[in-house]
Interface confidence: medium
């Protein structure tokens, strides 16, 4: 039910600079490339991470077991809930962490139902389909590189490439393509 091929196409020209471990501290990206993505913080998949983590209980804990992927929607329970919880094509957020990407953390939406929830019964109906809404996002991807021209990766050295990826930001309810 996930589409693993969320990666887009690399958009890099020429040979990117090969940064040593000293030039770039772990987890950081080159400032001139960061400038190209100055609005990263405003992108929903990036902004959501900090709000989700701020609301979290920090550190794992026992939590209720959900007995089914597609929830039963009860109006009285969701009046105060967020959009992704009140939707008839509800979704959850998965915080995706990739050390070789900047931003390292992105919030991916995952539809909880194959169908949609019937507003009258609160239960899933197969007469409608939940589909993901995708947003194109520019990210930086780091790759090992050689600083001595030998072609062999230099330990701790990385080059950065820009790349567009498609990030699911939510789900919506649609009519099936065929009945």
């Amino acid at each position: 039910h996930h589409d693993p091929s969320l990666r887009g196409h690399p958009h890099s020209h020429g040979t990117p600079h090969c940064y040593s471990a000293e030039e770039l501290p772990l987890g950081q990206a080159p400032p001139h490339l960061l400038a190209r993505g100055a609005k990263w913080g405003q992108a929903l998949p990036v902004a959501l991470v900090s709000s989700l983590e701020a609301a979290s209980h920090r550190g794992r804990h026992e939590r209720p077991s959900a007995t089914t992927q597609c929830p039963v929607l009860r109006p009285e329970e969701v009046l105060e809930a967020d959009t992704h919880q009140r939707s008839i094509s509800p979704w959850r957020y998965r915080v995706d962490t990739d050390e070789d990407r900047y931003p390292q953390k992105l919030a991916f939406a995952e539809c909880l139902c194959r169908g949609c929830i019937d507003a009258r019964t609160g239960r899933e109906t197969a007469a409608l389909n939940s589909v993901r809404l995708l947003q194109s996002l520019l990210v930086l991807r780091r790759r090992p590189c050689s600083r001595d021209g030998s072609g062999l990766p230099t330990p701790g050295a990385f080059a950065f490439h820009t790349e567009f990826i498609h990030v699911p930001v939510g789900c919506t309810c649609v009519l099936p393509r065929s009945v």
Epitope: L52, S56, G59, R60, H61, P64, P90, R94, V95
Partner: antibody, heavy 128, light 110 residues
């Protein structure tokens, strides 16, 4: 670039304890949890417990509760697993693994662990 | 604790596709818990092949794919190669933060 290097093989007597170390390099030690997984000869993988240095918390499998102690020394980026009251059934290869938690959010948080980097394994033989 | 059930063995010829299943219950695999898959060659440490049901770590061949339907997660290997012969384990985390592995599946490339 992340590497987990474990201590060498051990031969122990029944009733004694063993302490295996796991030194991490190439990443931020406190950013990730370290789990210990064992594998008896010809058997499957069995999770023993996890330490989360950032939150200072440890989680143990019920089977090993009271017998296993997992600790971490952030200054040396090393995690340790000590198993006491050893018996012959504890003969196994013990692995440390970096534990990345995927967290998903609906009405609650749901934690899922995955082990993306593993140590080379430490064979512990318990024999009289 | 949850129990994840895998077939003990699976076999296929080079170039073929094979699927390994991992069955749980509606409160774990069929609920909000993710499933990960590992490959282990004899005498070696396990290697993460698929995480969070269907995502591939960088460096893992796109011949490996994961999916989940109901209470069953599946690992599919297409274009089978000799080096794919290994043990494969599924793994998940239950609601009490207990990590559980399937019993393992031995893949034989004929």
């Amino acid at each position: 670039q992340v590497q987990l290097v474990q201590s060498g093989a051990e031969v122990k007597k029944p009733g004694s304890s063993v302490k295996v170390s796991c030194k991490a390099s190439g990443g931020t030690f406190s950013s990730y949890a370290i789990s210990w997984v064992r594998q008896a000869p010809g058997q499957g993988l069995e999770w023993m417990g996890t330490i989360d240095p950032f939150f200072g918390k440890t989680y143990y499998a019920q089977k090993f509760q009271g017998r296993v102690t997992i600790t971490a020394d952030e200054s040396t980026s090393t995690a340790y697993m000590e198993l006491s009251s050893l018996r012959s059934e504890d003969t196994a290869v013990y692995y440390c693994a970096r534990d990345v938690s995927s967290i998903s959010y609906y009405f609650h948080e749901y934690y899922s662990d995955r082990f993306d980097y593993w140590g080379q394994g430490t064979l512990v033989t318990v024999s009289s | 604790d949850i129990a994840l059930t895998q077939p003990a063995s699976v076999s296929g010829s080079p170039g073929q596709s094979i699927t390994i299943s991992c069955t749980g219950t509606s409160s774990d695999v069929g609920g909000y818990e993710y499933v990960n898959w590992y490959q282990q060659h004899p005498g070696k440490a396990p290697k993460l092949m698929i995480y969070d049901d269907s995502y591939r770590p960088s460096g893992v061949s796109n011949r490996f794919s994961g999916s989940k339907s109901g209470n069953t997660a599946s690992l599919t290997i297409s274009g089978l190669q000799a080096e794919d012969e290994a043990d494969y384990y599924c793994q998940s985390t239950d609601p009490h933060s207990t990590v559980v592995f399937g019993g393992g599946t031995k893949l034989t490339v004929l």
